[in-house]
């Protein structure tokens, strides 16, 4: 509860709002309103948000802080940033996993689950785009492999194996018989 601020305060402005009887200075981010000011243009009594709660903006009427969200372990979420008095927990996916939105119109607050990223190497393909916000984008087959159906097949190591046209172009030789 501070002394009087500049008396020329405007109740319709950003810094002072009518709370109860008077036009009061709001509470800073990370604080909730314990009691409104007791004089015109005075400071409200503001207290720091308790642990596991937050308020992200300066506010005039919040008499309690919002509860920090818990990341959904069932959806394989992890906390990228822990909750503080001024910011909610930021949930995301651990390295090697990507966000799969649970709704079609995906925004930052949409529910999501984490999916393991495709391992292009295990599929014998080049990694074209690393997995982060969406799944890994795999490219062409690695050297020593050729496209066959949906996968990459290893070049034959002997002339006994069949080597269709694509194989020949990549593996560098054609079966002779």
């Amino acid at each position: 509860q501070g002394g009087t601020r500049s008396p020329r305060c405007d109740c319709a402005g950003d810094f002072h709002k009518k709370i109860g009887l008077f036009c009061c200075r709001g509470c800073p981010a990370g604080h909730y309103l314990k009691a409104p000011c007791t004089e015109p243009c005075g400071n409200s009594t503001c207290l720091v948000c308790p642990q596991d709660t937050f308020l992200a903006w300066e506010n005039h009427h919040n008499s309690e802080c919002a509860r920090c969200q818990a990341c959904d372990e069932q959806a394989s979420q992890v906390a990228l940033e822990n909750c503080s008095a001024v910011a909610d927990t930021r949930c995301g996916c651990k390295p090697g996993w990507f966000v799969e939105c649970q709704v079609s119109q995906c925004v930052s607050s949409s529910p999501f689950y984490c999916q393991p990223c495709l391992d292009c190497g295990a599929l014998h393909r080049h990694t074209r785009l690393l997995c982060s916000r969406r799944d890994t984008d795999c490219g062409t087959c690695l050297p020593g492999f050729y496209e066959h159906g949906d996968g990459c097949v290893s070049c034959p190591t002997s002339t006994l194996g069949s080597c269709p046209e694509r194989c020949a172009a990549v593996c560098g030789w054609r079966q002779m018989f």
């Epitope: 009087t4 008396p7 109740c11 109860g20 009887l21 409104p36 007791t38 015109p40």
Partner: antibody
Framework: QVQLQQSGGGLVQPGGSLRLSCAAS????????MSWVRQAPGKGLEWVAT????????YFPDSVKDRFTISRDNARNSLYLQMNSLRAEDTAVYYC????????????????WGRGTLVTVSS | DIVMTQSPDSLAVSLGERATINCRAS??????????MQWYQQKPGQPPKLLIY???NVESGVPDRFSGSGSGTDFTLTISSLQAEDVAVYYC?????????FGQGTKLEIK
């Protein structure tokens, strides 16, 4: 015309409770802050509680804080003072009053008063 | 808290004479160019009645023999020509900040 009709006073033992009421008429009750002021026998005036219009924030002096609560029912045009843990020094005539705000200065004066109700705290 | 001190505690004035009551605040009650203080009259057995607001504004319906003056911390209520019906206790009160506080009262009698 503005009228403030009070009720609920009486004799109560120390530690007891009492609820005072003030029925308002003749003005738009919900648009005004309202107060309670008391006067001990043969003594001066002491502010006891105020409740704001609109958001109904309440204010008390330290002498009654945590013992008294002020509330309002705008639908019934009524003001209340709930007094708990009463002490001998709470013995007084209790007045309800309308707080009129003047201009844009956030300045209030009690422009209409009820006739008062006597609260006696004694064993 | 702002302490309001009235003087004198009691006053006897002849009918038709001027009565002056003073009130001093322990700190300024000015805000934005206005003195946030008022004067009340309380007759025996009756509730207080608002006479003057913002130090010098006479409330509607109050006889014009009542006037108020002053600013900052020092204020005066003046009754220019005392009438029999003016016998009462007079209180000053500040609304500058909570808790609202009253002066101890000045008892005005006829000499």
């Amino acid at each position: 015309q503005v009228q403030l009709q009070q009720s609920g006073g009486g004799l109560v033992q120390p530690g007891g409770s009492l609820r005072l009421s003030c029925a308002a008429s003749g003005f738009t009750f919900s648009s005004y802050a309202m107060s309670w002021v008391r006067q001990a026998p043969g003594k001066g005036l002491e502010w006891v509680a105020t409740i704001s219009d609109g958001d109904s924030y309440s204010y008390f002096p330290d002498s009654v804080k945590d013992r008294f609560t002020i509330s309002r029912d705008n639908a019934r045009n009524s003001l209340y003072l709930q007094m708990n843990s009463l002490r001998a020094e709470d013995t007084a005539v209790y007045y309800c009053a309308r707080d009129r705000i003047y201009g844009s200065v956030q300045y209030y004066a009690m422009d209409y008063w009820g006739r008062g109700t006597l609260v006696t705290v004694s064993s | 808290d702002i302490v309001m001190t009235q003087s004198p505690d009691s006053l006897a004035v002849s009918l038709g004479e001027r009565a002056t009551i003073n009130c001093r605040a322990s700190e300024s009650v000015e805000f934005s160019g206005t003195s946030l203080m008022q004067w009340y009259q309380q007759k025996p057995g009756q509730p207080p009645k608002l006479l003057i607001y913002a130090a010098s504004n006479v409330e509607s319906g109050v006889p014009d023999r009542f006037s108020g003056s002053g600013s900052g911390t020092d204020f005066t209520l003046t009754i220019s020509s005392l009438q029999a019906e003016d016998v009462a206790v007079y209180y000053c009160q500040q609304s500058r900040k909570l808790p609202y506080t009253f002066g101890q009262g000045t008892k005005l009698e006829i000499k």
